[in-house]
């Protein structure tokens, strides 16, 4: 049994780190493998993660962790029974992938404006809470040529779009993702998309 692609891990900077790797051949990850992890810290204990399959040769493990601080460093050992397949380390603060924003809602009852709101995925006491900026992707299922990214660089999880900039009488979809500039994170996954119908019509005089 051999590791083809070594485990690569990212932390959500809250309670979970996700490690993914590929094996040299088809593997029943949960039956054959264990990922052991231990914080490099006085009197810490070894904890075990049971991986799941992620495609034929891929495995993924969700490591439960405490709140992340910059000093945290974990040793990782990938075992197949009594055989040590791989040994490495992981510093969560240096490999952060934020959680995806949630509760994306579109408000179309605001005059001349489409208002999009969503929720910050972190509690106020988390360091990432005040560091997230967002990208909102809006596209049309009726007009494949229309797709826009709006960068939200302010803290408030809202975006206002003049309804007049969207075509009337067609449906749009939106999704949002986040990243934290000061923590040099990757982008989060996209939130689930939400759909709305743009019924806005310009006043008669402006037509």
């Amino acid at each position: 049994m051999k590791v083809l692609q070594e485990p690569a891990c990212v932390s959500d900077y809250m309670s979970i780190s996700t490690c993914e790797w590929k094996m040299g051949g088809p593997t029943n990850c949960s039956a054959e493998l264990r990922l052991l992890y231990q914080l490099v810290f006085q009197s810490s204990e070894t904890h075990t993660c049971v991986p799941e399959n992620n495609g034929g040769v891929g495995c993924v493990c969700h490591l439960l962790m405490d709140d992340v601080v910059s000093m945290d460093n974990y040793t990782l050992d990938l075992w197949a029974g009594q055989q040590l397949l791989w040994k490495g380390s992981f510093k969560p603060s240096e490999h952060v992938k934020p959680r995806a924003p949630g509760n994306l809602t579109v408000h179309t009852n605001v005059s001349d404006t489409v208002l999009l709101t969503w929720s910050n995925p972190y509690p106020p006491d988390n360091y990432l809470y005040n560091d997230l900026t967002y990208a909102v992707n809006i596209w049309s299922e009726n007009d494949p040529a229309y797709s826009r990214i709006h960068n939200v660089t302010y803290l408030k999880p809202t975006l206002r779009i003049p309804a007049s900039t969207l075509k009337s009488g067609i449906s749009y979809r939106a999704r949002v993702r986040a990243w934290a500039q000061h923590y040099n994170t990757t982008w989060s996954e996209w939130s689930p998309s939400t759909k709305w119908y743009n019924s806005y019509r310009e006043p008669f005089e402006q037509r």
């Epitope: 006085q42 009197s43 810490s44 204990e45 070894t46 405490d66 601080v69 910059s70 000093m71 945290d72």
Partner: antibody, heavy 125, light 112 residues
Framework: EVQLVESGGGLEQPGGSLRLSCAGS????????MTWVRQAPGKGLEWVSS????????YYADSVKGRFTISRDNSKNTLYLQMNSLRAEDTAVYYC??????????????????WGQGTTVTVSS | DIVMTQSPLSLPVTPGEPASISCRSS???????????VDWYLQKSGQSPQLLIY???KRASGVPDRFSGSGSGTDFTLKISRVEAEDVGFYYC?????????FGQGTKLEIK
């Protein structure tokens, strides 16, 4: 009531061996790291050894490394210190103390918040 | 190894007066914000040590509020706002950041 009771001290000749025990009660013993601290007559406190709650990680002072072994039996709620190749400078009162909660991912520290009454070890010919 | 240096080694105090003991570590014992791995212990004559302060400034259960701890990184202080006769004994700081744990030399507090 949270309590630690040491036993096993006594008089031993240089080069001899002793095994100290520390019985814990009133708390979930296996969840906590444990520590041994000693105090030579008229001297200050000296850390000797620590062990994680699951017994998987052990730590020793340089002065006892290779001679002393810390262990625990969580089924008996008991901590041990096996002392071999004893020297005159090992003469001291030995205390066990409850250390950090080590079953969490990052051990939670509340100080050495419970101490035993101490057991006296005298090494002399 | 981290070295813990305590001062003064002897502290005569009048009852009702404040007292202060300093402890300096040879390297930082700060793991993360608010988590300085320094404790303060009191050992009264003929007794086992008892915990007063942990993590630099957190008062242990049952410890009177006249005891307080402060400091961060490498410099720490134990303060007694009004010394009482029962406070006599040896005071030790200890770093629990990493093994080997190290105690300071001890400060003998006595009543004038």
């Amino acid at each position: 009531e949270v309590q630690l009771v040491e036993s096993g001290g006594g008089l031993e000749q240089p080069g001899g061996s002793l095994r100290l025990s520390c019985a814990g009660s009133g708390f979930t013993f296996r969840d906590f790291a444990m520590t041994w601290v000693r105090q030579a007559p008229g001297k200050g406190l000296e850390w000797v050894s620590s062990v994680s709650g699951d017994g998987g990680n052990t730590y020793y002072a340089d002065s006892v490394k290779g001679r002393f072994t810390i262990s625990r039996d969580n089924s008996k709620n008991t901590l041990y210190l096996q002392m071999n190749s004893l020297r005159a400078e090992d003469t001291a009162v030995y205390y066990c103390a409850k250390d950090r909660l080590s079953k969490t991912i990052r051990p939670r520290y509340y100080g050495l918040d419970v101490w035993g009454q101490g057991t006296t070890v005298t090494v002399s010919s | 190894d981290i070295v813990m240096t305590q001062s003064p080694l002897s502290l005569p105090v009048t009852p009702g007066e404040p007292a202060s003991i300093s402890c300096r570590s040879s390297q930082s014992v700060l793991y993360s914000i608010g988590y300085n791995y320094v404790d303060w212990y009191l050992q009264k004559s003929g007794q086992s040590p008892q915990l007063l302060i942990y993590l630099g400034n957190k008062r242990a259960s049952g410890v009177p509020d006249r005891f307080s701890g402060s400091g961060s990184g490498t410099d720490f202080t134990l303060k007694i706002s009004r010394v009482e006769a029962e406070d006599v004994g040896f005071y030790y700081c200890m770093q629990a950041y990493q093994s080997p744990y190290v105690f300071g030399q001890g400060t003998k507090l006595e009543i004038k």
